[in-house]
Interface confidence: medium
């Protein structure tokens, strides 16, 4: 039975040209994590495999950095990076757990003045 749960950073926003860390955390299971895939729509961004180590897909290697931990850092963000990102945890013996993150990349001025992060 799959008892684990994936906690993610949820819906996040970041400035165009900036960077963002995508993080997922698998909890409530003793299953062994054998591989984590990071995917965006139909494209594989990166793999972190227990045996293979990190592998960044060629089309993203200039803008994607592994870590921290099993997370992924996206750099030099563009508006086209807006969308859904998935962390896919392959585990043994449980199977596959998936977390979803929605990233919105905003023009600098919008991000600076976004109500979501304003401090009174």
């Amino acid at each position: 039975m799959m008892t684990g749960t994936i906690e993610t950073t949820g819906n996040i926003s970041a400035e165009k040209g900036g960077s963002i860390i995508l993080q997922c955390h698998l909890s409530s299971t003793t299953a062994q994590v054998t591989q984590v895939n990071w995917e965006q729509q139909d494209q594989l961004l990166a793999i972190c495999n227990a045996d293979l180590g990190w592998h960044i897909s060629p089309s993203f290697k200039d803008r994607v950095a592994p870590g921290p931990g099993l997370g992924l850092t996206l750099q030099s963000l563009t508006v086209n990076d807006t969308g859904e990102y998935f962390c896919i945890y392959h585990t043994y013996p449980d199977g596959t757990y998936t977390g979803r993150i929605f990233l919105e990349v905003l023009e600098s001025s919008v991000a600076e003045h976004g109500a979501r992060f304003q401090i009174p």
């Epitope: 054998t34 591989q35 895939n37 995917e39 139909d42 494209q43 594989l44 793999i47 495999n49 045996d51 293979l52 180590g53 990190w54 592998h55 897909s57 060629p58 089309s59 290697k61 859904e84 998935f86 896919i88 392959h90 199977g95 596959t96 757990y97 998936t98 977390g99 979803r100």
Partner: antibody
Framework: QVQLVQSGAEVKKPGASVKVSCKAS????????IEWVRQAPGQGLEWIGV????????NYNEKFKGRATITADKSTSTAYMELSSLRSEDTAVYFC?????????????WGQGTTVTVSS | DIVMTQSPDSLAVSLGERATINCKSS????????????LAWYQQKPGQPPKLLIY???TRESGVPDRFSGSGSGTDFTLTISSLQAEDVAVYYC?????????FGGGTKLEIK
């Protein structure tokens, strides 16, 4: 263009080892995982294992663990698959393949295949 | 390991007719989180390596004619050739790329009737 050129046919005696090479060209060798797949005469396809040429990390089909060793030489852009303790049922065509960015198990680029015959 | 079972083992179809090949996996290849099926179809002609036709159960690889289509989800998948051409004579394989070890079906040999 992308090319994977494999070494020539081999005839081996039972108990011996064979080392098949796969020389890559037309792309950055460390950017893509290299997989090995075999096909016995008149049979289907069997996945042997994978290497990340960037890190040297490997992952094997449990069936081949301890008998197959996959390595990569970055200086010559060549991947190798060595199979030891050969038996007659290892007679097969051995293929190397390169995945593409839609997923870590899809192989649009293949070597031409290397025929390994195990016979006393 | 995920076991992939193809049917039929062989199939004879007239030129211009529809050919249908089925593939069943022992575990679901659907990732419910992103709604993607991790299933691919390959075509192999004698003396050649396999050629990727379809991935994600239904997405054609670039350059593959649109008479080839894939469908299905979870554990049941189908490859359809809408109008068989002489050059389609080959063995067709389905493949799990959901989890290691990647496993292939036993193959379906397609011939002209």
């Amino acid at each position: 263009q992308v090319q994977l050129v494999q070494s020539g046919a081999e005839v081996k005696k039972p108990g011996a080892s064979v080392k098949v090479s796969c020389k890559a060209s037309g792309y950055a060798f460390t950017d893509y995982l290299i997989e090995w797949v075999r096909q016995a005469p008149g049979q289907g396809l069997e996945w042997i294992g994978v290497i990340n040429p960037g890190s040297g990390g490997t992952n094997y089909n449990e069936k081949f663990k301890g008998r197959a060793t996959i390595t990569a030489d970055k200086s010559t852009s060549t991947a190798y698959m060595e199979l030891s303790s050969l038996r007659s049922e290892d007679t097969a065509v051995y293929f190397c393949a390169r995945y593409h960015y839609y997923g870590s198990g899809l192989f649009p680029y293949w070597g031409q295949g290397t025929t390994v015959t195990v016979s006393s | 390991d995920i076991v992939m079972t193809q049917s039929p083992d062989s199939l004879a179809v007239s030129l211009g007719e529809r050919a249908t090949i089925n593939c069943k996996s022992s575990q679901s290849l659907l990732n419910s989180g992103n709604q993607k099926n991790y299933l691919a179809w390959y075509q192999q002609k004698p003396g050649q390596p396999p050629k990727l036709l379809i991935y994600g159960a239904s997405t054609r690889e670039s350059g593959v004619p649109d008479r080839f289509s894939g469908s299905g989800s979870g554990t049941d998948f189908t490859l359809t050739i809408s109008s068989l051409q002489a050059e389609d004579v080959a063995v067709y394989y389905c493949q799990n790329y959901h989890s290691y070890p990647f496993t292939f079906g036993g193959g379906t040999k397609l011939e002209i009737k």
